[in-house]
């Protein structure tokens, strides 16, 4: 077969080929940020000629053109400046309202490098309607000026802009517009991962039992807690495997889907996952009718077995057939469970379509969506039972109109996105499901995204301080109880002067709480073994603080999971009937277990907990410590099996002020406290006033650093005695 010519360079940009210079290969151009390729792609035809999708004239030279953002077509009840035909990247547009109107949205907006405006649509509103003025997004024209109950407004985009969102919206009885805000965008524009992750995550979290704390009060009356803990979600993942998706991109589709599956199973809901790959025909790798669809490892293994070559005989993009296979699956499940049963009617359905381009065979995918809506009886009352996310990847030949048509339209949410490349998709899936937005006391959730603050990453972390200097750290284990070290309280027992500083989204300094009562382990006595040459002994170094008020759960304040509790059992996705021993086996399951603690400056530091036969070699070093233990005859009297041991190799050592803080590990995107920082042989912060300065011990130091942490699995009787009414403990 002939190959296509190689004179296809783009000035100022680069290109990639999906299958070399052979027929069927897709050439994709890319340009530096702030520029876009024209054309975006070319396809090598069997004749050995390049064809530009959608082009009418012969091959034109590929160039990188400057990205521009659309101009306002009209702005009601106010003025905007400057008035340009379109705006360059970095350019601003400002809005002001006439007297009697209040500006809602962003007064100044900036054109971003992806051709999208930052901020929110500016609206000048006088609050006269039943619904708020829905505004006119930049580049759009609106017809309809009445905002009473039942009134409709329609939108279209000027010139060659593409509309995403709802072209028609209706003012509903609850004072909220139906559908989702329309946005007019350049055909070459795309979404940044950092915008998509929260938008997608917010919508998804609604389904997973979350409320969106950023929503306005009036709007938040809309879609609140959807899947209760007992509810069921069917998640259908549709992965495009057509010719224009390279094998490498398909691998990233798979990896992103795996991330999604991993995250979704970390929620405490019942979920079944279907996996469908498609090109000219769909291939069902996992059906929701299969019991294995409820098992994360089975679902991920079926994803891993998805093979790019499965579709090499038919390489078109038949999105209709893919969605239709979802419809057929639903139909079978409905027949199985019975159309009228609650078991069927209470299942919520989410479809995630990962594609790189428009469907080019099999008819309109919209028809399949209509069938799905029909079988699920989706109406205004049951709108929350179906969410379709259409995610286009690669700016090349993605059809905005089609994606927009397929994606659900829900107020304050977006369901259709285009990302620049598969790398961006991976980023989105890594960060989209931010469980930390949940408002109930779900435990062990930290925001793992790159731009999260330290407190958002470890929202259980608290500082315990007397009137003056900071002394200790601790961990929220419920909305009113903090777990910490007993030795923090050995100087005087008047806790009325003490404060506990808890994370607060409204303040970078957190929020201070008084202590209602302190429960200090009666077994703790630092001088208990003085006559054995042990000047300080830290057995039973554990305490509980009850705060004077309950902490409001937020992204910055949330309890960590305590092992051996029902709450942790749910987070570990373990079966009912699991025991404390099962938890210990799952969490402390290696001779060297990677774990973390939180530093004085709030950052998360790494340690390795030595278990089994390695514990003894870790702990024995203490016999070399002659200052703390001058006449020590039996090291076993200092380091009892109440302690976890770390500090070997590259471990960080906790500083003095970090005592009481949680020693925790991550499993299934959730965090579990297995210990609390108690004592050590080396203080890396000694002699430094700077919170950010830690000194590693010299390699020749005798004894080498070692750190000991109270092992919560060894403190179960005491924890159960005092927290029996607060947490639900499992049998030992």
């Amino acid at each position: 077969a002939p190959s296509c010519p190689q004179n296809v360079n783009i000035s100022g940009g680069t290109f990639t080929l999906s299958h070399g210079w052979a027929p069927g290969s897709l050439l994709t151009y890319s340009c530096p940020q702030g520029l876009y390729p024209s054309p975006a792609s070319r396809l090598c035809k069997s004749s050995g000629q390049w064809q530009t999708p959608g082009a009418t004239r012969s091959l034109s030279k590929a160039v990188c053109k400057p990205v521009r953002c659309p101009a306002p077509v009209s702005f009601e009840n106010g003025i905007y400046t400057p008035r340009l035909g379109s705006y360059p990247v970095g350019g601003n547009v400002s809005f002001e309202c006439e007297d009697g109107f209040i500006l809602r949205g962003s007064p100044v907006r900036q054109c971003r490098p992806n051709g999208m405006w930052d901020g929110e649509t500016a609206v000048c509103d006088n609050g006269a309607g039943h619904c708020p003025n829905p505004g006119i997004s930049l580049g759009a024209v609106r017809t309809g000026f009445r905002f009473g109950h039942g009134d409709k407004v329609r939108y279209r985009c000027s010139s060659n802009l593409v509309l995403t969102g709802s072209s028609e919206r209706e003012c509903q009885g609850n004072g909220v517009w139906s559908g989702t805000e329309p946005i007019c965008r350049q055909p070459y524009s795309y979404d940044f991962p950092e915008d998509v992750a929260p938008a997608l995550g917010t919508s998804f979290s609604h389904m997973l039992g979350a409320t969106n704390p950023t929503q306005k009060t009036k709007e938040s009356l809309g879609r609140k807690i959807q899947i209760q803990r007992s509810g069921h979600l069917n998640l259908y993942l549709l992965l495009d495997c057509s010719q224009s998706v390279s094998e490498n991109d398909f691998l990233i589709f798979k990896e992103s889907a795996s991330l999604m599956v991993d995250r979704i199973f970390s929620f405490e809901i019942n979920v079944s996952v279907a996996i469908i790959t498609f090109a000219s025909e769909p291939k069902v790798l996992m059906s929701v009718l299969n019991d294995n669809s409820r098992d994360m490892t089975e679902v991920i293994s079926s994803l891993e077995n998805a093979n790019y070559k499965d579709h090499e005989n038919g390489t078109g993009t038949n999105t209709y057939a893919a969605l239709n296979s979802v419809y057929l699956m639903m139909n079978n499940q409905m027949r199985l469970l019975g159309m009228e049963t609650m078991a069927w009617q209470e299942i919520r359905h989410a479809i995630i379509l990962l594609t790189d381009g428009k469907s080019n065979m099999g008819g309109s995918p919209k028809t399949a969506v209509d069938h799905i809506r029909e079988i699920l009886n989706i109406n205004q009352k049951r709108n929350d039972y179906l969410d379709i996310y259409a995610i286009g990847v690669g700016k090349l030949d993605v059809d905005w109109r089609e994606l927009n048509e397929l994606g659900s339209k829900k107020d304050g949410e977006r369901h259709a996105f285009i990302l620049q490349d598969t790398k961006a998709l991976h980023q989105v899936f890594e960060h989209m499901l931010d469980v930390s937005k949940l408002t109930d006391t779900i435990c062990g959730v930290g925001n793992m995204s790159a731009n999260a603050s330290d407190q958002e990453r470890t929202p259980w972390h608290v500082t315990i301080k007397p009137k003056s200097q900071e002394t200790c750290r601790g961990a929220l284990i419920s909305d009113q109880w903090v777990l910490t070290a007993a030795h923090c309280f050995r100087d005087g027992n008047d806790h009325s002067l003490w404060r506990v500083n808890v994370g607060d989204p409204k303040s970078q300094w957190g929020k201070e709480f008084l202590i209602e009562k302190a429960v200090i382990s009666p077994g703790f006595d630092v001088f208990a073994k003085k006559n054995q040459g042990i000047l300080e002994f830290y057995g039973d170094d554990i305490a509980l603080l009850k705060l004077a008020q309950k902490v409001k759960m937020s992204t910055h304040a949330r309890p960590i999971c305590l092992p051996c509790t029902m709450e942790a059992n749910l987070a570990l996705r373990r079966p009912q009937g699991s025991t404390c021993r099962d938890h210990e086996n799952e969490l402390l399951n290696k001779q060297s277990v990677p774990a973390h603690f939180v530093a004085l400056n709030g950052s998360k530091l790494n340690i390795n907990l030595k278990m089994g036969v390695e514990w003894t070699s870790c702990a024995e070093v203490v016999s070399q410590e002659k200052t703390m233990f001058p006449n020590l005859t039996d090291v076993r009297e200092v380091v009892t099996d109440q302690f976890l041991c770390s500090g070997t190799q590259e471990d960080e050592s906790p500083c003095k002020g970090e005592s009481g803080g949680a020693v925790f590990l991550e499993r299934r995107f959730r965090f579990f406290q297995v210990g609390l920082v108690s004592w050590g042989l080396y203080n890396p912060c000694l002699g430094s006033a700077d919170k950010n300065s830690r000194k590693r011990a010299p390699r020749s130091k005798v004894p080498p650093p070692r750190d000991f942490h109270i092992n919560l699995f060894r403190m179960q009787p005491w924890l159960r005695q005092h927290l029996g009414d607060v947490l639900n403990f499992l049998p030992l």
Epitope: R581, D582, E584, N585, E586, L588, N589, K590, Q591, M611, G612, V613, W615, T616, S617, D634, R636, T640, D641
Partner: antibody, heavy 122, light 108 residues
Framework: QLQLQESGPGLVKTSETLSLTCTVS??????????WGWIRQPPGKGLEWIGS???????YNNPSLKSRVTIFIDTSKNQFSLKLSSVTAADTAVYYC??????????????WGQGTLVTVSS | SSELTQDPAVSVALGQTVRITCQGD??????ASWYQQKPGQAPVLVGY???NRPSGIPDRFSGSTSGNAASLTITGSQAEDEADYYC???????????FGGGTKLTVL
């Protein structure tokens, strides 16, 4: 409740290799930090530790048995096995498999199989 | 040397207290564990660590350590306590395990 069951031939010829397998049920061989061990007891005598294996792959063997001992683990079958080469009549014993725990400063076997008698004959 | 020494036989009157001892250098470094074995049966763990008892073991069994010696004490011996008792610990190097020779307890 964890259960261990030894299996393998009850009779082995001198100089051949004794092979036994221990099947673990009621728990996963890879969960937690356990040392899956073999202990033997010649008729009318005391207990002798043969060796142990950790699911991470580390093995610990009795130096008196030198290089005759091989212990390996099959996580897919939830089993661990013992091979003792070049056996003699002195290797006749009841062979037990057990779950070993190293906790703090102590090491103990908390679950045992019921034992299987292996006789070495010429 | 890496060995544990036990008295071969000990007897006790029914209802009385008996101490079974185990000696060895490794006991300065590691705690002993104790097993009860009845004829034709597999050993059963009855004590370990400084003074720990597995669940299901009666509280008349207790352990202690002093220097290079460990002991298992049975307070108020019962007829069913008649059995062989073995001590076990890691050896002095910490790399291997050793068993004592066993003590035959007779309840009179």
């Amino acid at each position: 409740q964890l259960q261990l069951q030894e299996s393998g031939p009850g009779l082995v010829k001198t100089s051949e290799t004794l092979s036994l397998t221990c099947t673990v049920s009621g728990g996963s061989i890879t969960s937690g930090v356990y040392y899956w061990g073999w202990i033997r007891q010649p008729p009318g005598k005391g207990l002798e530790w043969i060796g142990s294996i950790y699911h991470g792959g580390n093995t610990y063997n009795n130096p008196s048995l030198k290089s005759r001992v091989t212990i390996f683990i099959d996580t897919s079958k939830n089993q661990f096995s013992l091979k003792l080469s070049s056996v003699t009549a002195a290797d006749t014993a009841v062979y037990y498999c057990a779950e070993g725990v190293s906790s703090g400063w102590s090491y103990y076997f908390d679950y045992w199989g019921q034992g299987t008698l292996v006789t070495v004959s010429s | 040397s890496s060995e544990l020494t036990q008295d071969p036989a000990v007897s006790v009157a029914l209802g009385q207290t008996v101490r079974i001892t185990c000696q060895g250098d490794s006991l300065r470094r590691f705690y002993a564990s104790w097993y009860q074995q009845k004829p034709g049966q597999a050993p059963v763990l009855v004590g370990y660590g400084k003074n720990n008892r597995p669940s299901g073991i009666p509280d008349r069994f207790s352990g202690s350590t002093s220097g290079n010696a460990a002991s298992l004490t049975i307070t108020g011996s019962q007829a069913e306590d008649e059995a062989d008792y073995y001590c076990n610990s890691r050896d002095s190097s910490g790399d291997h395990l050793i068993f004592g020779g066993g003590t035959k307890l007779t309840v009179l």
